[in-house]
């Protein structure tokens, strides 16, 4: 093809020419190209009008092209270009007019390009610029040059992993001249030693990220004090898991936060065994979102009912016990992957709509009722990857639930009553791998709106699937894999008119029967892989529903003998439905073991006796 | 298939091969070398990714003396405010990082362990790299 050796991803639009040892811009790519990836080619030098042949370009990726020189007007014809990526080029010479002509540029990525200063970076005319990423460079001064006043659309400025040590009042002077309240600024991984008090006074930012910046607690304390007067929608403070500098620290390090106006606050990876930190929390009582990630915190009983937090996130923290959580305004609580508190104790969160308590190894003495959470507004509940959860109430007061996930927790008392009877609004239910043994046909009664049911990795009395889905008239997805099933009721699926995907894989079925699927007019995917299917269990195999598009019978134990000829022929007739048909192999007899079923030519004659 | 040696410890010998077509060079150092009976140390990685690292996860396929364990998915980077600094690494950017590790050992039976690490990243998801680690557990220390 004319564009080779490049790869045509979308004809006439997107071409990938990555790592093809090109020394120059290819000339066999269509004029109409909008996305062009030339990364990892040794282009080394971009002269004027280098891309004259691609006037429609919108995205140009020049990552790691060993570019050392960019001349005036190198991109001059690219008036539609919105994204220019220059990551990893050892640029030594950048002409003043290098970026001229880029009248629509919105994203400029100059990461790891040997950039030593913003002052000499010739981008002042790029008025449409929304995102400037100059991370991983050699920038020492945080002085935002005068030309920034032209960049009135700038929303993201990434200066992370540079060499900035000091921030002075004059550095941010230009931000006072422009109404950039939407600017997100990332200064992470700069070795900041000093922020002049007042430098951020009356400056508004959308997001400020300061992670792994300080190698000393006193420096951190004075720098946070230096942020006084800043109004920021989201403040992210702390360290990275693989870039740890600070020793165990005390709450005084964060006292300066009281002098900021913050809407959302996130603290990550700090080894502070925070104990009585009520002063800190009181400073942040009015934020709408409060997040602690990987912070060692003994107890959070100091959270006040009156805090205005609407979203609280506690992830990978250590607690002495499950915290007392009583918060009037909270709408979302994410409490995941924490250590310490092994038993859930009820919370009082009257406004709560979203609750994720996954991956804590928690045990629940009872579940579930509005009294456990203090709310009747809950729509999303994730209790997955916990310990023993004893089902003692059928979700009284929690009738608004739409999403419920118990996977990989150990559910007790699931077959004693209709646990989900109240949940007429539930759309998604996952009880996979919950040690549930279905011994009660009413287990799913009440789930009138359910669309997705995942129950893989459980078991059934006598390994038989009874008629337990009668209420699930809206079900579209059902996963019954790894349930040790051997047989199923012929009417098990009779009410599932909307079912589209049925996973019966990894069970112990020895024969295939089409009869149970006759009432599934919407079925598109049926997976019977990894069973022990040898044959069909009746001579007259009917057709699957006409809607069926994918049938997976791989990794079964097909008996490729004359007595099963009609079944093997029936399989061949279903060829257009079969998924990975080449993995359907004979198991018996031994001389045919491993042979693909579809390539068999079984000619059988009746022996006359 | 060329084997790249990583290290030897008192109870293990570790090497890897590439299990993808690309075989983009990746440098891995472990100091001190992992002991299966339990150890802590530093894993140093030098790598130039061929796609953005954001939303990185590993698919782990572990084989113990020819017995394959179920696939395990380990999410490393979720996409914003991530745990690791390398989660923000872009295609073509040098990743030169050190990650501390520690684990309490369990009693491993002697033999050969294989661990295929499929690194998937980006949006749309594509393979970043694939490495197959061979860990020979020395019988003397079990």
């Amino acid at each position: 093809e004319s564009w080779e050796p490049c790869v045509e991803v979308v004809p006439n639009i997107t071409y990938q020419c990555m790592e093809l040892k090109f020394y120059k811009i290819p000339d066999n790519i269509p004029f109409s190209t909008k996305n062009l990836d030339l990364s990892f080619n040794p282009l080394r030098h971009l002269g004027s009008y280098s891309f004259l042949r691609f006037p429609e370009l919108q995205v140009l990726d020049l990552s790691r092209c060993e570019i050392q020189t960019i001349e005036d007007g190198a991109y001059q014809s690219l008036s539609h270009l919105s994204t220019l990526i220059l990551t990893g080029n050892p640029i030594q010479s950048l002409a003043l007019g290098a970026f001229s002509g880029l009248s629509s540029l919105q994203k400029l990525v100059a990461v790891e390009t040997n950039l030593a200063s913003l002052e000499n970076f010739p981008i002042g005319h790029l008025k449409t610029l929304k995102e400037l990423n100059v991370a991983h460079n050699l920038i020492q001064s945080f002085k935002l040059p005068e030309y920034f006043s032209n960049l009135t659309n700038l929303e993201h400025l990434d200066l992370s992993s540079n060499k900035i040590q000091n921030i002075y009042c004059k550095d941010l002077q230009v931000l006072h001249q422009m109404p950039l309240s939407n600017l997100s600024l990332d200064l992470s991984l700069n070795p900041i030693n000093f922020i002049q008090p007042g430098a951020f006074k009356e400056i508004r930012l959308h997001k400020l990220t300061l992670r792994s910046n300080f190698d000393d607690l006193n420096v951190m304390k004075t720098c946070i004090q230096g942020l006084a007067g800043l109004e920021v929608h989201r403040l992210v403070l702390g360290e990275f898991r693989n870039e740890r500098n600070l020793e165990e620290f005390d709450k005084s390090s964060l006292e300066g936060l009281c002098n900021l106006t913050i809407e959302e606050f996130r603290l990550t990876y700090l080894d502070c065994y925070l104990d009585n930190i009520i002063d800190l929390f009181n400073c942040l009582a009015n934020v709408s979102s409060f997040s602690l990630v990987s912070v060692n915190i003994k107890r959070v009983e100091d959270f006040s009912y009156n805090f205005r937090w609407q979203h609280l996130e506690l992830v990978n923290c250590k607690f002495e016990q499950f915290p007392t959580l009583e918060l009037k305004s909270l709408k979302r609580l994410t409490f995941t992957a924490n250590k310490g508190g092994n038993a859930f104790s009820e919370v009082d969160l009257p406004s709560l709509e979203f609750l994720d308590l996954s991956r804590n190894g928690l045990s629940f003495k009872g579940c579930c009722s509005q009294s456990d959470f203090g709310t009747t507004s809950l729509k999303y509940l994730d209790l997955s990857f916990n310990d023993v959860i004893t089902m003692s109430s059928n979700f009284l007061g929690l009738e608004q639930l739409e999403h419920l996930d118990f996977q990989h927790s150990n559910l007790k008392q699931m077959s004693q009553f209709s646990v989900f009877l109240s949940l007429r609004n539930l759309i998604y239910l996952d009880i996979s791998h919950t040690h549930t043994r279905v011994a009660f046909n009413g287990i799913f009664d009440g789930l009138l709106s359910l669309k997705v049911l995942k129950m893989a990795g459980n078991s059934f009395q006598e390994n038989f699937l009874p008629d337990i889905f009668t209420d699930l008239k809206n079900l579209t997805f059902l996963d019954l894999s790894q349930c040790q099933l051997e047989q199923l009721s012929p009417t098990a699926f009779d009410t599932l008119n909307k079912l589209q995907v049925l996973n019966m894989s990894h069970n112990n079925f020895f024969s295939l029967d089409t009869f149970p699927y006759k009432c599934l007019p919407s079925l598109q995917v049926l997976d019977y892989s990894l069973n022990h299917i040898m044959t069909s269990n009746n001579q007259e195999l009917q057709h699957f529903p006409s809607s069926l598009a994918f049938l997976n019978l791989t990794q079964n134990d097909f008996a490729c003998t004359c007595e099963h000829q009609s079944f093997l022929q029936w399989i061949k007739d279903q060829r257009q439905l079969l998924v990975e048909a080449e993995r359907m192999e004979c198991a018996t007899p031994s001389d045919k073991q491993g042979m693909p079923v579809l390539s068999l030519n079984i000619t059988c004659q009746m022996n006359k006796t | 298939q060329k084997h790249y040696w990583v290290c030897n410890s008192s109870d293990a010998s570790i090497s890897y091969t590439y299990c993808d077509k690309m075989q983009y060079p990746i440098s891995i150092n472990v100091n001190p070398c992992i002991k299966l009976k339990g150890s802590r140390g530093l894993l140093h990685i030098f790598y130039i990714p061929r796609r953005d690292v954001k939303q990185l996860y590993f698919n782990l396929y572990i084989t113990v003396n020819s017995m394959t364990l179920p696939k395990r998915k380990e999410v490393i980077c979720r996409g914003s405010d991530d745990d690791y600094s390398f989660c923000r690494a872009l295609k073509g950017e040098t990743v030169n990082t050190t990650v501390s590790f520690s684990f309490k050992g369990i009693k491993f039976s002697k033999g050969k362990y294989k661990c295929v690490v499929e690194a998937i990243s980006g949006s749309p998801e594509e393979m970043l790299f694939c490495l197959e680690f061979d860990i020979i557990h020395q019988p003397n220390s079990n």
């Epitope: 009983e301 007392t324 009583e326 969160l349 009257p350 003495k365 003692s392 109430s393 | -």
Partner: antibody, heavy 118, light 107 residues
Framework: QVQLQESGPGLVKPSDTLSLTCAVS?????????WHWIRQPPGKGLEWMGY???????DFNPSLKTRITISRDTSKNQFSLKLSSVTAVDTAVYYC???????????WGQGTLVTVSS | EIVLTQSPDFQSVTPKEKVTITCRAS??????LHWYQQKPDQSPKLLIK???HAISGVPSRFSGSGSGTDFTLTINSLEAEDAATYYC?????????FGGGTKVEIK
């Protein structure tokens, strides 16, 4: 509307076991919440004794742990208190109450006086 | 266990006067403190939860404040029907405990 009603003997001999029952109407005791016993000696303050959770789990005040039992009869929607080896200091008005999700008590029975005397 | 100390034990007040009752906790309990009113021969009635949140149906003259260890219940303009004993209760941790009570009588 949730209502609680205590019942049981008003007089118990020293060293005997005090037994009280709380009948609940308007809410199932297995449907949610925890169900508590609180007592008040004549002319004195309130003392929390213990509870039974809707799941059947129980917990008690450490000061009474060796003598107290709380159980329930779900078919009658009631829960009971047993306090063994009583003495005169156990003379009190005994209240049953329902605790809210926050650790407070919006619903109380009217109380029943139990006198320990020979 | 957390000890709650109420003061005064007794208060004699004329109608329309302002009444202030304090409750001090032996350790910080944030705002996990609740107030009850108990009239003679009646069971206690929840008035205020979480230090300052009035229960619906409770007259607006009742208010609460405080956080940490020091809390106050205020009756702004005492009425005859307010003659009762008032108890504070901490909900910070088990065992749940009550203050000793403050008896308010009308002069």
């Amino acid at each position: 509307q949730v209502q609680l009603q205590e019942s049981g003997p008003g007089l118990v001999k020293p060293s005997d076991t005090l037994s009280l029952t709380c009948a609940v109407s308007g809410y199932s005791i297995t449907g949610g919440y925890s169900w508590h016993w609180i007592r008040q000696p004549p002319g004195k303050g309130l003392e929390w004794m213990g509870y039974i959770h809707y799941s059947g789990y129980t917990d008690f005040n450490p000061s009474l742990k060796t003598r107290i039992t709380i159980s329930r009869d779900t078919s009658k929607n009631q829960f009971s208190l047993k306090l063994s080896s009583v003495t005169a200091v156990d003379t009190a008005v005994y209240y049953c109450a329902r605790k809210d999700s926050g650790k407070n008590f919006p619903y109380w029975g009217q109380g029943t006086l139990v006198t320990v005397s020979s | 266990e957390i000890v709650l100390t109420q003061s005064p034990d007794f208060q004699s007040v004329t109608p329309k006067e302002k009444v202030t009752i304090t409750c001090r906790a032996s350790q910080s309990i944030s705002d996990h403190l609740h107030w009850y009113q108990q009239k003679p021969d009646q069971s206690p009635k929840l008035l205020i939860k979480y230090a300052s949140h009035a229960i619906s149906g409770v007259p607006s003259r009742f208010s609460g404040s405080g956080s940490g260890t020091d809390f106050t219940l205020t009756i702004n303009s005492l009425e005859a029907e307010d003659a009762a004993t008032y108890y504070c209760q901490q909900g910070h941790s088990f065992p749940l405990t009550f203050g000793g009570g403050t008896k308010v009588e009308i002069k």
